[in-house]
């Protein structure tokens, strides 16, 4: 027994206790002072005296005590048959319980887990499912990267047969560079030799230049002579043209007295036999108004009338719209015609324009127009030009469709400047356009750089200015 | 329409400095040399600087070369001259030209130096 404990109560009995787990039990026993004498023959129903009997000496004390505790003894054992007894039935009982409630206990846990086992399960299969999805899906990427990896290997097994063509043909290029470079060195070689067999020869030829210079200065001299003897001879002829006139005249009606012969243009004084180069009286038909011309009877068959004449920077060209109208300087020289008298010339017939033109080192050009006319000066004397040839540029330097005729203080031009005031000059402006052969006259070494001179641009470009200009028009079908 | 429109010109002191500038429209700018040119009261035009269609190269008059600089801006369709150090003879208006057939010119824009 887990615990046995023995107190005294309030009335003098003997209280016992026993603990056995969480029961606990009680028992109530009379004292044994008073007991029957081992001697005496024990009766179960006999009744317990209140009060002891007292004995004097210590052996019948001892046999007293004797009884007691063989009493006492007896007591405890019955007690203990009795727990015994009692607690065989309990512990049977508390078994029963234990089993009972631990089944009920086991069979909820074993519930739990079923439904726990269930929702794994289905859990589980949720997961499976998205497992299968998912290698599905990877299944199906890998096979998509598959092929796109046979692609590319294909591309680049493509790429590289590429390559190995290009550098092929590279490698074919850079040898054939390298001949080229060859060949270009000796070409090089060859053109040096060439340039120095050049040079010899300029200095040559300018030896003989300097001597043929000589040799012109004295046949101008000689020339100047000659004309001298020319003029005299020609006034010679005069005198006694006059003297025969005067005496066939009652023989010869045909030839009036003062009769003078008038000429349109230098075509028709070439016509009319006068085949020298020279300053000509010109009179439209239908007027009496004359102007001088100066007329070209050598170049390309002759019989061309000047309008225009650029050689020295001796006369002013930036001119009112009038003075351009009536035109100005000198015939021999440098002049303007005069827009009235070519507006009026062209419109009469088809005329061809030639404009010539030579630069400061010494070259020619020319721009030919096989149709040209001028509108009246209501239509401010407006530039028509057809069919450019000649080498002085393939497209015209004058702009085409024609521009209208301005100077400094008539601006007819395209542009938000004043053409005629800034590049000086009358001329048929446009924006301000690729020429004007009235502009400033400069002089070599001065004549580049400049954007008011004398300027042809499809020939010598924007800043070049002219060494002469001269520009000279004829009928179409001389 | 082709325009050239210059700006950037006024009074200044002699030794200050200014920036012209010349917007260009209706051609091809980037296909032409351009050039300042300049027109003093009373006188005649005068070469100022050109430079190439790409700006690769510049060209000055002797009586700038050092002062002036010019350059171009093809993506801007714009050309420039800046001036420094100027003197009163600087005194003129300034045109920008295109080297095209055409020849195209501005208005033009003034520049004094004067104290």
């Known amino acids: 027994y887990n615990n046995f404990r023995k107190s005294m109560d309030s009335i003098g009995k003997k209280q016992y206790q026993v603990q056995h787990g969480s029961c606990s039990y009680t028992f109530l026993l009379p004292e044994m002072d008073n007991c029957r004498s081992s001697s005496s023959p024990y009766v179960s129903n006999a009744v317990q005296r209140d009060a002891p009997l007292e004995y004097d000496d210590s052996v019948q004390r001892l046999q007293v005590l004797e009884n007691i505790m063989e009493n006492n003894t007896q007591w405890l054992m019955k007690l203990e048959n009795y727990i015994q007894d009692n607690m065989k039935k309990e512990m049977v009982e508390i078994q029963q319980n234990a089993v009972q409630n631990q089944t009920a206990v086991m069979i909820e846990i074993g519930t739990n887990l079923l439904n726990q086992t269930a929702e794994q399960t289905r859990k589980l299969t949720d997961v499976e499912a998205q497992v299968l999805n998912q290698t599905t899906r990877l299944e199906l990427q890998l096979l998509e990267h598959s092929l796109s990896t046979n692609k590319l290997e294909k591309q680049i097994l493509d790429q590289t047969s590429e390559i190995n063509k290009l550098q092929d043909k590279n490698s074919f290029l850079e040898k054939k560079v390298l001949a080229m470079e060859d060949k270009h060195i000796i070409q090089l070689q060859s053109i040096k030799e060439e340039k120095d067999q050049l040079q010899v020869l300029v200095s040559k030829q300018n030896s003989i230049i300097e001597e043929l210079e000589k040799k012109i200065v004295t046949a101008t001299v000689n020339n100047s002579v000659l004309q001298k003897q020319q003029h005299d001879l020609m006034e010679t002829v005069n005198n006694l043209l006059t003297m025969m006139s005067t005496s066939n005249s009652a023989k010869d009606p045909t030839v009036a007295k003062g009769e003078q012969i008038s000429f349109r243009d230098c075509a028709e004084v070439f016509k009319s036999g006068h085949t020298t180069n020279g300053v000509y009286t010109l009179t439209l038909p239908n007027s009496t108004e004359e102007v001088k011309a100066y007329c070209d009877m050598e170049a390309g068959g002759g019989g061309w009338t000047i309008i225009q004449r650029r050689e020295d920077g001796s006369v002013d060209f930036q001119r009112t719209w009038k003075e351009y109208k009536v035109g100005f300087g000198n015939p021999s020289g440098e002049y303007w015609l005069g827009n009235e008298f070519v507006s009026q010339l062209t419109n009469q017939q088809r005329y061809v324009l030639k404009i010539h033109l030579k630069d400061w080192e010494g070259n020619e050009a020319y721009s030919l127009y096989e149709h040209f006319y001028l509108s009246s000066e209501e239509l401010n004397y407006r530039i028509h030009l057809k069919g450019l040839t000649g080498t002085a540029g393939k497209i015209s330097s004058i702009s085409q469709p024609g521009n209208d005729f301005s100077t400094k203080d008539a601006d007819n031009d395209k542009c938000i400047c004043k053409c005629s005031q800034m590049l000086t000059g009358g001329w048929w402006f446009d924006a301000c356009g690729p020429s004007n052969l009235n502009g400033m006259y400069y002089p070599q070494r001065q004549n580049t750089n400049k954007f008011n001179g004398i300027k042809w641009y499809y020939w010598k470009g924007s800043g070049y200015s002219l060494k002469g200009t001269t520009m000279m028009i004829r009928p179409a079908g001389f | 329409e082709v325009q050239l429109v210059e700006s950037g010109g006024g009074l200044v002191q002699p030794g200050g400095s200014l920036r012209l500038s010349c917007a260009a429209s209706?051609?091809?700018?980037?296909?032409?040399?351009m050039s300042w040119v300049r027109q003093a009261p009373g006188k005649g035009l005068e070469w100022v600087s050109s430079?190439?269609?790409?700006?690769?190269?510049?060209y000055y008059a002797d009586s700038v070369k050092g002062r002036f600089t010019i350059s171009r801006d093809n993506s801007k369709n714009t050309l420039y001259l800046q001036m420094n150090s100027l003197k009163p003879e600087d005194t003129a208006v300034y045109y920008c030209?295109?080297?095209?057939?055409?020849?195209?010119w501005g208005q033009g824009t003034t520049v004094t130096v004067s104290s």
């Open positions: 030209n295109a080297d095209h057939p055409q020849g195209y």
């Open positions: 430079i190439t269609w790409s700006g690769g190269s510049t």
């Open positions: 209706g051609f091809t700018f980037s296909d032409f040399g």
